[in-house]
Interface confidence: low
């Protein structure tokens, strides 16, 4: 039943034409290019995919022509090597140019950029927006996908796509309405922060394939999806995990159309089997292509068969246990992890993957003694402490959240993570202990059952974020090691991080915690994301210093931003008031 | 192969303090879960304290926390308990236990450790 097997083409760039359409087809050549050359301008990038367009147009009418049997890395990497300024703008990348495929798309691959050096995507008003979308609304629409995928190097292409048809079905609507702003705003803060958490989510998978290679992968496909679809036997999810894993493999390395393509055979092979999949399907079967794909990636989990027997059995008192393991290792340990994940919703994927991992060592060790059966029989013992760590970790930092609400809880992770690693830059520290203390208003109110897949998975999305930032320029070991060595023990291995004892602390500069009247006009975030940035260097200077001091020095440091923005002459205000409050906190630290 | 060689024990009164190491050779010992049991006369192997493999999460039995504490000094691949307010019933042969495979938490059943050193006697009296 293997969906992705294929006649071979005459010409992929026809085939991948004539299956996606025309307008799915450019939007794709243009994401891809985009998230290749991030810092080219839009104009080049559509010129670009209009040569490559009009090309493929040639191949789907007569598929021997010249260079149509080419690769399409080929094809497109070609194109690519035609920019003139590669060298001036992006350097050593222009050095893949002098490579042969596959080596050059890899070396494109590499120069990746998680964090590139682009301006901040500023929303001009509504009216201007409506404007250039009643223009010219193809460019406009072509826009989005080029700031996004250019932003967001890894975004999931054809998922992309979906949040460019709510996109254009936004201005659509709204453009309209007697109160556009109104209709609108709400509209494109939800597709931002919707798109921030599927370029996250995304980054983490293509990390595990990368970094810990396919098997990392599929081990985190077989518990997710055994927990979403319970009912459905092991057969059916190993077949669904292998043509998962194939859709990321493609996307994740770049192969934009392949991926796209067998993403929509995937959701079609889907549908017509959800009968042996999940009962939970059928709504989102019946939407469009894009709506459909995006609806299974995100649909609840299934019930529970009933009466589902010990796992005990199978994997403890049998006496084929060694036996069914040597004969295929993982297979049984992906049987194990499938009939574990289905009965523990209510566990994170990362948890159930450290439970089959202390399985596998246990059998590994065991298999190989003289009483395999007597070495093994406590091994579910073992996983008492590693459910019970996430357990308590989650209950004290809900407990912590509800305390203090989102904006302190973020203030105390802040806190937290500088202590632990303050060699990180101060803006990926904001970042990351920004978006760690958003677990607490996404999961701590929900029930204990879905807590912890909640928390603990949002976390894993979370820390990636950090250990890709950190990687582009890596600075601290500590987060080296627990980036690298064990995908599904970072948390831990971040949780288990004390104080650094060996940063020397920073030098003070009065100039970190000079503030000017500008404070006043941003929004209620950006001022937030002034103090917090304030916050990380003060423990920076001072990573002594006790909850105490620092809460004193922040509360004085708010009243003083309250007070210059109510006065008359705010920048003489903030000047004057700001030396006093450096003095004063000076002081209050012993700096 | 791992070899273990424990060191440090002896006799001491009640309330008194004793440091036990553990030297380990054919492995670095940040790479592996290990841990310290104990074996009083007549008795089978209890598990008192582990540290896992990879990340510096530590593990102890209730009858000795805030007591004990197990620690690792990865440039001399070294593995410590340092044993706090003793009392008669901690005394026994004290044995550090290695797992293979860096799995994150130590266990507390000593069949799971393959590799053992040949322990140290600690003798708690007055």
């Known amino acids: 039943r293997g969906v992705f097997r294929r006649d071979a083409h005459k010409s992929e760039v026809a085939h991948r034409f004539k299956d996606l359409g025309e307008e799915n087809f450019k939007a794709l050549v243009l994401i891809a290019f985009a998230q290749y050359l991030q810092q080219c301008p839009f104009e080049d990038h559509v010129k670009l995919v209009n040569e490559v367009t009009e090309f493929a147009k040639t191949c789907v009418a007569d598929e021997s022509a010249e260079n149509c049997d080419k690769s399409l890395h080929t094809l497109f990497g070609d194109k690519l090597c035609t920019v003139a300024t590669l060298r001036e703008t992006y350097g050593e990348m222009a050095d893949c140019c002098a490579k042969q495929e596959p080596e050059r798309n890899e070396c494109f691959l590499q120069h990746k950029d998680d964090n590139p050096n682009l301006p901040r995507l500023v929303r001009p008003e509504v009216d201007v927006m409506c404007t250039a979308f009643h223009d010219n609304e193809e460019t406009f629409l072509k826009k989005y996908l080029y700031e996004i995928a250019r932003r967001h190097p890894y975004f999931y292409a054809p998922e992309l796509l979906f949040f460019a048809k709510r996109y254009k079905a936004a201005f659509t609507e709204c453009c309209q309405a007697a109160d556009k702003a109104a209709c609108l705003l709400p509209k494109l803060d939800e597709l931002r922060d919707e798109g921030k958490a599927s370029s996250a989510k995304q980054r983490l998978k293509c990390a595990s394939l990368q970094k810990f290679g396919e098997r990392a992968f599929k081990a985190w496909a077989v518990a997710r999806l055994s927990q979403r679809f319970p009912k459905a036997e092991f057969a059916e999810v190993s077949k669904l995990v292998t043509d998962l894993t194939k859709v990321h493999t493609e996307c994740c390395h770049g192969d934009l159309l392949e991926c796209a393509d067998d993403r929509a055979d995937l959701a079609k092979y889907i549908c017509e089997n959800q009968d042996s999949i999940s009962s939970k399907l059928k709504e989102c079967c019946e939407k469009p292509l894009l709506e459909k794909s995006h609806c299974i990636a995100e649909v609840e989990n299934d019930e529970m068969p009933a009466d589902l027997p010990s796992l005990a059995a199978d994997f403890v008192e049998s006496k084929d246990v060694c036996k069914n393991y040597a004969e295929a290792k993982d297979v049984f340990l992906g049987m194990f992890l499938y009939e574990y994940a289905r009965r523990h919703p209510d566990y994170s994927v990362v948890l159930l993957l450290r439970l089959a991992k202390t399985y596998e060592t246990t059998l590994e060790k065991c298999c190989a003694a003289a009483d395999p059966h007597e070495c093994y029989a406590k091994v579910f013992d073992e996983f008492k402490p590693l459910v019970e760590e996430p357990q308590n970790l989650i209950k004290q930092n809900c407990e912590l959240f509800e305390q203090l609400g989102e904006y302190k809880f973020q203030n105390a992770l802040l806190v937290r993570y500088t202590k632990k690693v303050p060699q990180v830059s101060t803006p990926t520290l904001v970042e990351v202990s920004r978006n760690l203390g958003k677990v607490g208003s996404k999961c701590c109110k929900h029930p204990e059952a879905k807590r912890m897949p909640c928390a603990e998975d949002y976390l894993s999305v979370v820390l990636n974020q950090l250990c890709v930032l950190h990687e582009k320029t890596p600075v601290s070991d500590r987060v080296t090691k627990c980036c690298t060595e064990s995908l599904v023990n970072r948390r831990p291995c971040f949780s288990a991080l004390e104080v650094d004892e060996t940063y020397v602390p920073k030098e003070f500069n009065a100039e970190t915690f000079t503030f000017h009247a500008d404070i006043c006009t941003l929004s209620e975030k950006e001022r937030q994301i002034k103090k917090q940035t304030a916050l990380v260097e003060l423990v920076k200077h001072k990573p002594k210093a006790t909850k105490e001091q620092l809460k004193a020095v922040m509360d004085d440091f708010a009243a003083f931003v309250e007070k210059c923005c109510k006065a008359d002459d705010k920048e003489t205000c903030f000047a004057e008031e700001g030396k006093k409050l450096v003095a004063a906190s000076q002081a209050a630290l012993g700096l | 192969e791992v070899q273990l060689l424990e060191s440090g024990g002896g006799l001491v009164q009640p309330g008194g303090s004793l440091r036990l190491s553990c030297a380990a050779s054919?492995?670095?010992?940040?790479?592996?879960?290990v841990a310290w049991f104990r074996q009083a006369p007549g008795k089978g192997r209890e598990f008192v304290a582990g540290i896992g493999g990879g990340v510096d999460i530590t593990y102890y039995a209730d009858s000795v926390k805030g007591r004990f504490t197990i620690s690792r000094d990865n440039s001399k691949n070294t593995l410590y308990l340092q044993m706090n307010s003793l009392r008669p019933e901690d005394t026994a042969v004290y044995y550090c236990?290695?797992?293979?495979?860096?799995?994150?938490?130590?266990?507390?059943?000593?069949?799971?450790?393959?590799?053992w050193g040949q322990g140290t006697l600690v003798t708690v009296s007055s």
């Open positions: 236990g290695t797992r293979p495979g860096r799995p994150l938490i130590t266990s507390k059943v000593a069949d799971l450790y393959p590799y």
């Open positions: 054919g492995r670095y010992i940040d790479e592996t879960a």
